[in-house]
Structure formats: C-alpha cells, structure tokens
C-alpha cells in the first residue's frame, strides 16, 4: 500500500490522543534505555509503511502485536484516514484473527513495541517531509 | 561486530539476472536493522538499490524497481539481491550494507559484476 | 529526486592543513544527511550522520554542520589517512535516498 495520501494530520492526532498511551502501556515496567532503535524512518508515507509492517508482520521471537490495543486502533486509523487502505487489509484480517488466540508478551515483543515507538516519534516530527 | 561478505558471478550476460548474496556474522538479520544493497560504477558515485528490514518489510530505489527484489534466509544468515535483465550500465562493485532504513553503518568490501556477453 | 552537488570536485592539500568539503541539495533535506569516507579498493565508512552527529568510532577532527540545503564536512587537521574521497548522502526523500558524486581530498 501506498502511504502518500494519507491524512497525515489526522493519524498524528489519533496517535497524539490514544496510539501513545496504548504503546506506553503495553511498555509499563520496562525502561526507556532498555532497547536500541535499530530502524527509522525518512518521511511520513515511509513511517507509516514501516509501522504498518512492523505491527502486523510476525517477526521472530514475537508472533503477532496484531491483537493488541495500539494495533486495532493503528489499523483504524490507517483505515479511516489512508484511502483504499482497508481493501488491502483483508489477509492481515485472517492474520489478527488467529493471533487472538495467544496473547503473550515476550521480550522480543517490548524491543518491537519500543521499535515502533521510535517510529511514531519520527512521524510526528514536525520537520518530518509530508512525501 | 558484525561483518557482511559478499558473493556471486563476477561476469554476467546481458538480459540475464545478476544474482549476489550477502553473508552476514556477528549480528542476525532477524534481530534488528534493515539489510541493504549498494552499488557504485567504476570510477562513479554510490548508488542505494534497496532494503529488507529484520522484520521483513522491503524498500526499492523507484528507478530500479521494476527490475530488482531483495529476499532473505534467515535460517542462513544471508540476504540476497536480484536484478534482472541486466545491460552493460549494470556493470559496477555491489555492495551490502546494514541500515537503519536511513544511512549505512556497516558496509561488506563489495563484489565487482561485470555485464558482458 | 533530490540532487546532491559536492564541492570542489578535487581538494589538494598538506597533511595537518583544514579540508573543507560542501555538499549542497536540490531541495531542504532539513538535517536527514550522513559522511562516507572511501579509500581506493574499499568499502565506504560512515563518518556523519543526521547532518553533525559522529558516527562510533569517529575522530574528533572530523565534524559536520548544515541543515536545509547546504551542508559541509571539515576536517580540523589532515592525517595522512584522511586523503580519500568524501560522499554525501540525503535520507530526506524516501526511497529516492541519493549520494553525491564525491570529493577528493588529496595531497599536495
């Protein structure tokens, strides 16, 4: 999916409002040092293309984030405001889907959750290139 | 500290696929950063080609991308570039590199392919 | 695409003398701009990033400075494994990351 025209605007205030709170919670316990950033981001299709990919996809040591609170309300916001998103969206559907069944947080999990936080703080950069 | 190795056929035809791989010790794919292939020309400037992240996303230069796909193994440690329908303009040392989707920290020594018939 | 335009093409100068190398971008890449060293028959190093951060294991004599579309690397007092050439590199404009055509610093 193409990220260029997204509400840009409105995705940062829905993560300003709700998004961070959920990452900071799924974080509770764990210092802000504890995990190096690895990956960043260039602009704002790129942030968000790295944010979809990073929340959804199943990485190793860490099966899915898809069920957790901060992704079903990613997942809305992309959908609400990236138009066309949610016609793209129907495989990673099946993939939340059955990821509902297990809800462990490893700590492979907490280095992804700190990932994405670096990701969104980019994102919400206000120098930050629209496209 | 990590360590990238490049390898593949020094010499490939045109209209044929370029095909390298970049070994990576020290560090696993899966773990962190993206993965990303470099080229330069001989005598020329660097070009970036593209990334595979740890987690699997994936990035292409726009004006290779039609020709270009990038994968990884990461039960080998390994990550693999493509490059189809290769002319003489394609001739240059590629490198590997480790990213942070941004700039390249950690770059492998580089491997020439030349595109001859 | 953003073009990156590296100044002067060549750089002669003496070991302990001040290099000063400019890069200059088609268009604001705010401070989303890194260094590479390359020696002949070597990878490039990454020296800068972010426009004036040191990357580990940098010397000190190496420092960057700019934002927006002008930037420039210096080097306080050549060592003789300084001579080599320079890239530049915006990260302002995913996926069209572009290099500049490099400097040479070589002795005089």
């Known amino acids: 999916y193409d990220f260029t025209n997204c509400d840009f605007e409105k995705i940062k205030a829905a993560y300003l409002s709700t998004i961070s709170k959920d990452l900071i919670t799924y974080m509770s316990g764990t210092k802000s040092t504890e995990f190096n950033n690895t990956v960043s981001c260039s602009n704002r299709p790129h942030c968000l293309t790295e944010i979809q990919s990073l929340t959804f996809n199943p990485t190793a040591g860490c099966a899915s984030l898809a069920k957790e609170m901060f992704a079903m309300k990613t997942k809305a916001a992309l959908a609400i405001w990236c138009p066309g998103y949610s016609e793209t969206q129907i495989n990673a559907t099946q993939a939340m889907k059955k990821a509902r069944k297990s809800k462990v947080t490893t700590n492979k999990c907490l280095e992804q959750v700190s990932q994405l936080q670096g990701l969104w703080r980019r994102f919400n950069r206000p120098l930050l290139k629209q496209q | 500290q990590v360590q990238l190795q490049e390898s593949g056929p020094g010499l490939v035809k045109p209209s044929e696929t370029l095909s390298l791989t970049c070994a990576v010790s020290?560090?696993?794919?899966?773990?962190?950063?993206?993965w990303s292939w470099i080229r330069q020309p001989p005598g020329k400037g660097l070009e970036w080609i593209g990334y595979?992240?740890?987690?699997?996303?994936?990035s292409y230069n726009p004006s290779l991308k039609s020709r270009v796909t990038i994968s990884r193994d990461t039960s080998k440690n390994q990550f693999s570039l493509k490059l189809s329908s290769v002319t003489a303009a394609d001739t240059a040392v590629y490198y590997c590199a480790r990213t942070n989707l941004l700039y390249f920290d950690s770059w492998g020594q580089g491997t020439l392919v030349t595109v001859s018939s | 695409e953003i073009v990156m335009t590296q100044s002067p093409a060549t750089l002669s100068l003496s070991p302990g003398e001040r290099a000063t190398l400019s890069c200059r971008a088609s268009?604001?890449?705010?401070?989303?701009l890194a260094w590479y060293q390359q020696k002949p028959g070597q990878a490039p190093r990454l020296l800068i990033y972010?426009?004036?951060s040191r990357a580990t294991g940098i010397p000190a004599r190496f420092s960057g400075s700019g934002s927006g579309t002008d930037f420039t690397l210096t080097i306080s007092s050549l060592e003789p494994e300084d001579f080599a050439v320079y890239y530049c590199q915006q990260y302002s404009d995913w996926p069209q990351y572009t290099f500049g055509q490099g400097t040479k610093v070589e002795i005089k």
């Open positions: 020290g560090y696993s794919i899966s773990s962190g950063y993206g």
């Open positions: 595979i992240s740890y987690y699997g996303s994936i």
């Open positions: 972010d426009a004036s």
């Open positions: 268009q604001s890449v705010s401070n989303n």
